[in-house]
């Protein structure tokens, strides 16, 4: 603000964020992932930080465990509000398997197609939720090579609550986690102790989202 | 269009190694959209997965065979290869290579290899 | 080790009949996963179908495929001379892949 109070330049605030993006979050509903509540808070707090519309930011979203559901298409909804009831509504699918390869090339495939409400010309992200190594996780290098083909951007979180509350070494599920991040890592990564946690990362994680289009 | 050619020794002796190489053409091996692999048929039955490559190097083995099989990839010859060490008369089989994206959808015509002394 | 188990291992059928295959797995394969394979006497398998139901490239529609779970099945709505051949299921989902023993589809 100058001497004379006039406005010399302004910062939008992250969360006013009215960039053009197709995100489509793919979340794994397997049986393993507990709490639910903790996923739709984290996809609450995620979304309310968006501006959501036709000429803005689009989302949609995919659940996927043995089988892969599309919960909502990238133009089903055209306000923030509306995106936020739908998310809320969502319901665990579950399924004995994690098939993670399988959800994100379903979205690759199918979530971001003009028929569903992807833009041309328009940045397509990926958010990839998981808390577990995939059973197919064998097919994992050509989903993400398909991935970086189509120029989709994508960040993973890694869920760590089953293993630590099993004591297990999240070694191995880490390193898988981080394989299906863009690069670089480091920015596209995320793991969180348990489900719980995922409300803290939010906050970085629509900075980097929002950051794609600066 | 894309074609494979399997090709390699056709008698191999009881402790050896098999060597076989699959050469692709019409296309490239290095297009990361496929895993390349060897299958194989014993006589008069069905068929079994050994394993396969991504471009990069990465593998993916059958547990049943996987202490006996190496697969690899030369992007540069547009080949990939199977060695499989330590054959019985069990190992006695046609061996395919096939191209795999959704499903295997190019195969070699395949080649017979009989371990015999 | 998904498990697949085809039946009946031989269909005795005349052209022009239709031919339902079975294809069940052990454990629930996910329908994005399995495809199908022809194969005649002397020859590499031939890819018929994809996610359980999409006909590959130059395959006929005569050719069909449904299923979901554990059960899946292929049906040739009227068979042509060439269909008599080995059919095999395929799931590739979980490691190792696997395939079925086959179906046999002969000439009666």
């Known amino acids: 603000v100058s001497p004379t109070f006039q406005v010399v330049n302004s910062i939008a605030p992250v969360q006013e964020c009215s960039t053009q993006l197709d995100i489509v979050i793919v979340l794994d509903g397997s049986n393993s992932i507990y709490p639910w509540d903790s996923v739709t808070a984290f996809l609450n707090d995620l979304l309310e930080r968006m501006d959501i519309g036709p000429k803005q930011t689009q989302v949609g979203i995919v659940q996927y465990g043995e089988n892969v559901t599309h919960e909502f298409n990238l133009n089903k909804y055209s306000s923030t509000e509306e995106v936020l009831v739908a998310a809320n509504k969502i319901v665990q699918r579950g399924g004995r398997q994690t098939m993670t390869a399988l959800g994100i090339d379903t979205a690759r495939k199918e979530a971001f197609t003009e028929a569903r409400g992807a833009r041309r010309g328009v940045k397509k992200v990926m958010v990839i939720v998981t808390d577990g190594e995939s059973h197919d996780n064998h097919r994992l290098k050509k989903v993400i090579q398909d991935c970086e083909d189509e120029n989709i951007q994508r960040f993973s979180i890694a869920i760590l609550g089953s293993y630590n509350r099993g004591n297990l070494s999240t070694e191995k599920f880490v390193e898988e986690i981080k394989s299906i991040a863009s690069e670089p890592t480091e920015k596209h990564f995320f793991n969180v102790s348990d489900e719980l946690a995922l409300v803290t990362i939010v906050k970085t994680l629509g900075e980097r989202i929002f950051a794609l289009e600066a | 269009q894309v074609q494979l050619q399997e090709s390699g020794p056709g008698l191999v002796k009881p402790s050896q190694t098999l060597s076989l190489t699959c050469t692709v053409s019409g296309g490239s091996i290095s297009r990361g959209n496929y895993y390349w692999s060897w299958i194989r048929q014993h006589p008069g039955k069905g068929l079994e997965w050994i394993g396969y490559i991504f471009y990069s190097g990465s593998t993916y083995y059958n547990p049943s065979l996987k202490s006996r099989v190496t697969i690899s990839v030369d992007t540069s010859k547009n080949q990939f290869s199977l060695k499989l060490s330590s054959v019985t008369a069990a190992d006695t089989a046609v061996y395919y290579c096939?191209?795999?994206?959704?499903?295997?959808?190019?195969w070699g015509q395949g080649t017979t290899v009989t371990v015999s002394s | 080790e998904i498990v697949l188990t085809q039946s009946p291992g031989t269909l005795s059928l005349s052209p022009g009949e239709r031919a339902t295959l079975s294809c069940r797995a052990s454990q629930s394969v996910s329908s994005s996963y399995l495809v199908w394979y022809q194969q005649k006497p002397g020859q590499a398998p031939r890819l018929l179908l994809y996610?359980?139901?999409s006909r590959a490239t130059g395959i006929p529609d005569r050719f069909s495929g449904s299923g979901s779970g554990t059960d899946f099945t292929l049906t040739i709505s009227r068979l042509e001379p060439e269909d008599f051949a080995v059919y095999y299921c395929q799931q590739y989902g979980n490691s190792p892949l696997t395939f079925g023993g086959g179906t046999k589809v002969e000439i009666k």
């Open positions: 096939a191209r795999d994206g959704y499903g295997m959808d190019v």
């Open positions: 996610d359980a139901s």
